[in-house]
Interface confidence: medium
C-alpha cells in the first residue's frame, strides 16, 4: 500500500473526527433532559403576584411507564450545591406542590390546598411549568427551586433542578410592577448547547451514512491521485477547507450578551414561548399529606429509613 500522503492522512483524520463527533452527538445526549430558568431574578413589590417559571428542555421519553414529577421548593444561598436543601413555600412542602404526568402534558396542583396559601403550580404542553404566588410579602423573598424527576414505573431515573431568586421590596424604592432579569449568558449557553446537542443527535443519525460514504470516496480519490497530490501538495494544502470545521466568527448579532437586562413584568400569567398561557384549570386532586407521610427535608441519605429512597 505504501505510506499514506499528507492529504490522504489528513482527509482520513477529518473523516474520523467527523465520524467521532457525529457518533458522540448521536449517542451522547439521548437520556439527558435539562431544566432552564428563563429568569434568574424576580424583583417585585409587596402585595403583587408573581409567576416563577422553569422549562423542561431536551429529549423527553414518552414511554408508557415514564412519568415526570415536577415540583417547587425554597432553598438557601451559600450552599455547596444549590437547591440541595428543601424548605417549604408558605408552609407547603414540595410534596404538596408537586405535579405528576407523562412527558409534556398539562397539569395543576389541587386548588383547595394550594390556593388557601395563595399558591398554584401548573404545567403546560410545551415543557413550561410554573408556580404562581399571590399577594407577596417580604417573607417570600429568597431562593426558589424547581425540580423535575423522571420516573420509570416506580423508580426515579433522572433528576434536574433550576434555581431563581425572588426579591420582594417595600417602600419608595420598590418597583410598581415585578421586574424580571434574564438568566446569565452562561445559563443561556448551556441551554443552547442542550438544544444543539439534541439537534446534533438527530442530524448525526441522519448524516452518518452520508459521512461514511464521503470519507470512503475521499480516501479512494486520494489514493488514485497520490502522485499528482505529492507534486502539488505544497500549493494545495493551505487551500483545504472543511465546511464542517470553519471557525465561527464572533457572534455580532447578539448585543450585550453578558449584560443582564431587567424586563418589565406584567403580574399575571407568564406566557409560554409558544404564546399560550399556562393552564389554570385544576387537574387531579391532591390530598394534603397525612401524619404518616414521608417528607424529604434534605438530600442527605437517612440511614436505614424504610419509607423512602433518597434520589
Amino acid at each position: 500500500m505504501g505510506v499514506p500522503t499528507a492529504l490522504e492522512a489528513g482527509s482520513w483524520r477529518w473523516g474520523s473526527l467527523l465520524f467521532a463527533l457525529f457518533l458522540a452527538a448521536s449517542l451522547g445526549p439521548v437520556a439527558a433532559f435539562k431544566v432552564a430558568t428563563p429568569y434568574s431574578l424576580y424583583v417585585c413589590p409587596e402585595g403583587q403576584n408573581v409567576t416563577l417559571t422553569c422549562r423542561l428542555l431536551g429529549p423527553v421519553d414518552k414511554g408508557h411507564d415514564v412519568t415526570f414529577y415536577k415540583t417547587w421548593y425554597r432553598s438557601s444561598r451559600g450552599e455547596v450545591q444549590t437547591c440541595s436543601e428543601r424548605r417549604p413555600i408558605r408552609n407547603l412542602t414540595f410534596q404538596d406542590l408537586h405535579l405528576h404526568h407523562g412527558g409534556h402534558q398539562a397539569a395543576n396542583t389541587s386548588h383547595d390546598l394550594a390556593q388557601r396559601h395563595g399558591l398554584e403550580s401548573a404545567s403546560d404542553h410545551h415543557g413550561n411549568f410554573s408556580i404562581t404566588m399571590r399577594n407577596l410579602t417580604l417573607l417570600d423573598s429568597g431562593l426558589y427551586c424547581c425540580l423535575v424527576v423522571e420516573i420509570r414505573h416506580h423508580h426515579s431515573e433522572h433528576r434536574v433542578h433550576g434555581a431563581m431568586e425572588l426579591q420582594v421590596q417595600t417602600g419608595k424604592d420598590a418597583p410598581s410592577n415585578c421586574v424580571v432579569y434574564p438568566s446569565s449568558s452562561q445559563d443561556s449557553e448551556n441551554i443552547t448547547a442542550a438544544a444543539l446537542a439534541t439537534g446534533a443527535c438527530i442530524v448525526g443519525i441522519l448524516c452518518l451514512p452520508l459521512i461514511l460514504l464521503l470519507v470512503y470516496k475521499q480516501r479512494q480519490a486520494a489514493s488514485n491521485r497520490r502522485a499528482q497530490e505529492l507534486v502539488r501538495m505544497d500549493s494545495n494544502i493551505q487551500g483545504i477547507e472543511n465546511p464542517g470545521f470553519e471557525a465561527s466568527p464572533p457572534a455580532q448579532g447578539i448585543p450585550e450578551a453578558k449584560v443582564r437586562h431587567p424586563l418589565s413584568y406584567v403580574a399575571q400569567r407568564q406566557p409560554s414561548e409558544s404564546g399560550r398561557h399556562l393552564l389554570s384549570e385544576p387537574s387531579t386532586p391532591l390530598s394534603p399529606p397525612g401524619p404518616g407521610d414521608v417528607f424529604f427535608p434534605s438530600l442527605d441519605p437517612v440511614p436505614d429509613s424504610p419509607n423512602f429512597e433518597v434520589i
Epitope: 411507564d65 412519568t67 414529577y69 410534596q95 408537586h98 405528576h100 404526568h101 407523562g102 424527576v149 420516573i151 420509570r152 414505573h153 416506580h154 423508580h155 426515579s156 431515573e157 387531579t284 386532586p285 391532591l286 390530598s287 394534603p288 399529606p289 397525612g290 404518616g292 407521610d293 414521608v294 424529604f296 424504610p306 419509607n307 423512602f308 429512597e309 434520589i311
Partner: antibody, heavy 122, light 112 residues
C-alpha cells in the same frame, strides 16, 4: 396506622364480572402506588398491576390486560379491581398492597390487605 | 418476564438452626438507576405476605436482625440466623426492577 381493608369473598358465575375493593386508611391515598396480586394454590404470587391514585396512572402485567381493570376513587380512598369474563382460572385470592411513595420508591409492597377470595363456579 | 427461581422448595429446620434460602433471577435485576430492587416476603399460613427485606439487604422496619439479605446481579440469599417458631411459613423473593415485577415460586420453611 396504615391499613388496607378489602371487600368480602365473592362466588361468581363463569363469564360474568366481579369488582373487588380495597379501602385505604392511615396515609395519604393519593401519594402512593396501590398494587394488586393474585394467589392461586400451587401458582404462587402474580403481580396483576398497580395504580397511582394521585394521577390515575396504571401499569398492567401483559398477562392481565383485558382481564383486570384498575380504578381508584380518591374521595373515598378506595381502589377497585374489576375482573371480567371470569373462568375457573380466575378463582384465587386477590390481595391489594400499598406500593412505594410516588417520588422514587425503595420497594413495592409494604402494607397488604387481608385478601379477597374469588370463586368462579357454575 | 424475569423468572425468579427459588431453592429449595421446602426447607425443614430445627428451631435455633440457621436457614438459608436462595433466589436466582433469569437476568440481571440491577435497575437502570443503579439500584437492585430485590425483596423478600414471608407469608404465614392464612395471612397476607409481609415485607422483610428490600433492596437486597435492607431490613424493613420491625423486622428482627436475625434476618439478613445478600447477593448481587442474579444471585441472592436470605439467611435466618436462629430460626424461631414465628418464622415458619412460605418465603418469596421478588424483583421490582423490571416490568412486570415477578415473584419467586416460594420456599416453605417448616419444622424438621
Amino acid at each position: 396506622q396504615v391499613q388496607l381493608q378489602q371487600s368480602g369473598a365473592e362466588l361468581v358465575r363463569p363469564g360474568t364480572s366481579v369488582k373487588i375493593s380495597c379501602k385505604a386508611s392511615g396515609y395519604t391515598f393519593t401519594n402512593y402506588w396501590l398494587g394488586w396480586v393474585k394467589q392461586r394454590p400451587g401458582h404462587g404470587l402474580e403481580w396483576i398491576g398497580d395504580i397511582y391514585p394521585g394521577g390515575g396512572y396504571t401499569n398492567y402485567n401483559e398477562k392481565f390486560k383485558g382481564k383486570a381493570t384498575l380504578t381508584a376513587d380518591t374521595s373515598s380512598s378506595t381502589a377497585y379491581m374489576q375482573l371480567s369474563s371470569l373462568t375457573s382460572e380466575d378463582s384465587a385470592v386477590y390481595f391489594c398492597a400499598r406500593g412505594g411513595y410516588y417520588y422514587g420508591s425503595s420497594w413495592y409492597f409494604d402494607v397488604w390487605g387481608a385478601g379477597t377470595t374469588v370463586t368462579v363456579s357454575s | 418476564d424475569v423468572l425468579m427461581t427459588q431453592t429449595p422448595l421446602s426447607l425443614p429446620v430445627s428451631l435455633g438452626d440457621q436457614a438459608s434460602i436462595s433466589c436466582r433471577s433469569s437476568q440481571s435485576i440491577v435497575h437502570s438507576n443503579g439500584n437492585t430492587y430485590l425483596e423478600w416476603y414471608l407469608q404465614k399460613p392464612g395471612q397476607s405476605p409481609k415485607l422483610l427485606i428490600y433492596k437486597v439487604s435492607n431490613r424493613f422496619s420491625g423486622v428482627p436482625d436475625r434476618f439478613s439479605g445478600s447477593g448481587s446481579g442474579t444471585d441472592f440469599t436470605l439467611k435466618i440466623s436462629r430460626v424461631e417458631a414465628e418464622d415458619l411459613g412460605v418465603y418469596y423473593c421478588f424483583q421490582g426492577s423490571h416490568v412486570p415485577p415477578t415473584f419467586g415460586g416460594g420456599t416453605k420453611l417448616e419444622i424438621k
